[in-house]
């Protein structure tokens, strides 16, 4: 499999058949698949060097692994997008052997002197062809030469099979399955041959191809493949319930932010709640996690403005739950990215020198910002797309707080909507779905560059749109939701999570 280790070294060779038998639409589809693969790999913070070859009668090398920009995923994608099926129109035979020889030449070193660390670099060949080679001879011989060059399968004690993977995608109207199977790697419990039909669900294909065991702690990563559970799709999501004897129980959501911490809303708890009465579950697991301590933001005080006629005041409505035992990360339990951390800088593929302010400009620009939250409906987690009103609609969004029960007599809306809040909901630019009571404490998320970054904590809403556990379809335009802006509580997060290796900026 493609071992995605951010600290490892890898070369990926993309080889695309542009011969007559492929056809223009299949060629475009294959290109799109490769673009998606480059993006998927880049989303792991891995920077392999790419080689890019198209071929028909002759190969054409578009990107060499030795080029300075070969590890710049955006640049490689640009080169790939600029390739046309017409480029091989005049010489449109199928010489797969020559194409693989071009890969061999990129792999080999001048003067036969192996460079330092050559044996630590993993090589991945992704060949997109119909297998109908009609000139140049059998391409399998080049695969043998490549294995020989990389010293694979020679030493029984150290066969080095992990250092070469050959994936073959059958593209085109007619595919010679025998030829394709012959070229692909054969490894136990791994799939190295894919068909056109597979390419309709690329996430399933990538799931078969990628080994992410070295990067399970990366924040904001998800799997969207069809066999995945709700928690593959939102592995940070935590369910919280507080059991209060004789008072029933309170349900909230939260987000895993480190091996020991879940971030949620402070209003989910009272000062009387004992640690053993708080239940947290993650990853869709049935068992509850033991709680060591709940840390409230020191400025949170729900009764803070009672004297001023404000029955409930949600400023600084955030809390961190520290778990007694460390979470074991896996595909269904992973942290979400937090603002102003090194992890988020890498997730957004920004320069290491990026400041907190620059992250804020990237994630919360002064405009309508596409975001999402996760809600549970009929025992299923679903993503709800909303827009954070952070531009010209911000004022009107915040003013609608006056329609919230108990806030009708508030003279100045800034008394309740402090600078700590982000506002969603309403009907412009689109009709946003609203949060329900049980969504409180869950993350408000921005999805960027295939990664998920938490920007807010769901706090309160103007209208209860979920009476009788059902989300109403028709809601008034003033149905707004308010979320604690994480950029506004960073000093507290930084202090409380200082031992969690998140690398706050």
């Amino acid at each position: 499999k493609i071992v995605l280790d951010p600290s490892g070294s890898m070369n990926i060779y993309l080889v695309l058949d542009g011969s007559d038998s492929i056809g223009a639409s299949n060629f475009t589809g294959a290109k799109k698949c490769l673009v998606n693969l480059i993006e998927k790999v880049a989303s792991y913070g891995v920077k392999p060097r790419y080689g890019l070859v198209t071929y028909a009668t002759y190969p054409k090398i578009w990107v060499k692994v030795s080029e300075a920009d070969s590890s710049n995923a955006d640049w490689v994608t640009k080169q790939l997008n600029e390739i046309n099926y017409e480029d091989h129109k005049l010489k449109s035979g199928t010489n797969t052997k020559k194409a693989l020889q071009a890969v061999y030449s990129m792999m080999s070193w001048p003067d036969d002197v192996p460079p330092e660390g050559w044996n630590r670099t993993r090589h991945v060949i992704i060949l997109m062809t119909d297998g109908l080679h009609n000139m140049g001879g059998d391409p399998i011989t080049v695969i043998d030469e490549i294995r020989d060059l990389l010293y694979i399968g020679k030493d029984r004690k150290n066969p080095r099979e992990d250092y070469l993977d050959v994936y073959v995608f059958g593209v085109g109207p007619l595919v010679n399955q025998v030829n394709i199977n012959a070229l692909a790697s054969k490894k136990d419990n791994e799939q190295h041959v894919f068909k056109v039909k597979d390419m309709e669900n690329l996430e399933d294909v990538f799931y078969q191809m990628i080994d992410e065991s070295q990067s399970l702690s990366l924040c904001g990563m998800v799997w969207e493949h069809r066999k995945g559970t709700d928690y593959h799709k939102q592995p940070w999501q935590a369910k919280i319930s507080v059991i209060r004897p004789s008072k029933g129980h309170e349900s909230c959501m939260g987000a895993v932010v480190s091996e020991y911490f879940v971030l949620t809303a402070a209003h989910c708890f009272t000062v009387d709640d004992k640690e053993h009465s708080i239940k947290v579950s993650v990853g869709g697991e049935k068992r509850d996690l033991e709680i060591e301590v709940v840390l409230f933001h020191p400025n949170y005080n729900i009764n803070g403005k009672k004297e001023a006629g404000i029955p409930e005041f949600y400023d600084y409505d955030v809390a961190l739950i520290k778990l007694k035992n460390k979470l074991k990360y896996g595909q269904t339990i992973r942290p979400i990215c937090l603002p102003c951390t090194e992890g988020t800088t890498r997730a957004l593929r920004l320069p290491p020198t990026t400041t907190c302010q620059q992250q804020k400009e990237e994630l919360l620009p002064a405009q309508d910002i596409k975001a999402l939250f996760v809600s549970e409906e009929e025992k299923k987690l679903t993503r709800k797309e909303v827009y954070i009103k952070n531009g010209d609609k911000k004022g009107s969004c915040e003013r609608d707080a006056q329609y919230a029960p108990g806030y009708d007599k508030v003279k100045d809306i800034s008394e309740v909507v402090t600078p700590r809040f982000l506002c969603t909901g309403g009907v412009s630019p689109y009709a946003d779905p609203n949060t329900c009571r049980g969504d409180s404490g869950g993350p408000l998320i921005v999805h960027k560059r295939s990664r998920f970054i938490q920007v807010g904590v769901i706090s309160w809403g103007v209208v209860d749109v979920c009476k009788n556990q059902k989300r109403q379809k028709q809601v008034p335009a003033h149905a707004r939701d308010f979320h604690i802006n994480l950029f506004q509580v960073l000093p507290w997060l930084k202090e409380k999570l200082q031992d969690e290796d998140l690398g706050f900026l």
């Epitope: 020991y260 911490f261 004992k274 640690e275 053993h276 060591e292 301590v293 840390l295 961190l320 520290k322 007694k324 035992n325 460390k326 409380k496 200082q498 031992d499 969690e500 290796d501």
Partner: antibody, heavy 121, light 107 residues
Framework: EVQLVQSGAEVKKPGESLRISCKGS????????IHWIRQSPSRGLEWLGY????????DYNQKFKDRVTISADKSISTAYLQWSSLKASDTAMYYC??????????????WGQGTLVTVSS | DIQMTQSPSSLSASVGDRVTITCRAS??????LAWYQQKPGKAPKLLIY???TLQSGVPSRFSGSGSGTEFTLTISSLQSEDFAVYYC?????????FGQGTKVEIK
């Protein structure tokens, strides 16, 4: 200055009960964990358990869970370690120590002077 | 429980010597390792936590390094007051566990 002052040495018979104390001063007692550790020549240093003095939440090393009880009285900034029925194998020096601020993954930065418990018939 | 193994169990050194003590964990504890110094009749004293962070008030001749399962305490230039027993302790997972100790004696 941060100080943890423990109660004096104890000599007890097997089967007797005992409670030793640890009084914290020079810091906000309710903001930090209190841990109990014992030391004997044969078994070295062993962590017994800890308490959140603010909420009373405690947890134990499974090995000692049925032998000791950890409690605290935040009104007098004092933590306790108690036994309902002592054994000769409980003979050791017992230390209380301050852990990190609640929520932090810190080691024990201040230690009491120790309480020597001797159990002998 | 995580086992902590220190080596050597004792060593003899002179004032001014560079001394290195190793601690190995039975499974990865990330960076969460502490080092303590204990003198006869006294309680242990924290020197280093989180693998390499010097506790305030501790002389800079003490340093810690390592992560995962292998850790090292180094005393760059041994002073007469440094002759004592040194313990490592993991503070990553409960129950917290200690090494068996390394006695640093005068040569």
């Amino acid at each position: 200055e941060v100080q943890l002052v423990q109660s004096g040495a104890e000599v007890k018979k097997p089967g007797e009960s005992l409670r030793i104390s640890c009084k914290g001063s020079g810091y906000t007692f309710t903001n930090y964990w209190i841990h109990w550790i014992r030391q004997s020549p044969s078994r070295g240093l062993e962590w017994l358990g800890y308490i959140n003095p603010n909420t009373g939440y405690n947890d134990y090393n499974q090995k000692f869970k049925d032998r000791v009880t950890i409690s605290a009285d935040k009104s007098i900034s004092t933590a306790y370690l108690q036994w309902s029925s002592l054994k000769a194998s409980d003979t050791a020096m017992y230390y209380c120590a301050r852990g990190g601020q609640l929520g932090l993954r810190r080691a024990m930065d201040y230690w009491g002077q120790g309480t020597l418990v001797t159990v002998s018939s | 429980d995580i086992q902590m193994t220190q080596s050597p169990s004792s060593l003899s050194a002179s004032v001014g010597d560079r001394v290195t003590i190793t601690c190995r964990a039975s499974k990865s504890i990330s960076k969460y390792l502490a080092w303590y110094q204990q003198k006869p009749g006294k309680a242990p004293k924290l020197l280093i936590y989180s693998g390499s962070t010097l506790q305030s008030g501790v002389p800079s001749r003490f340093s810690g390094s390592g992560s995962g399962t292998e850790f090292t305490l180094t005393i760059s230039s041994l002073q007469s007051e440094d002759f004592a027993v040194y313990y490592c302790q993991q503070h990553d997972e409960y129950p917290w566990t200690f090494g068996q100790g390394t006695k640093v004696e005068i040569k």
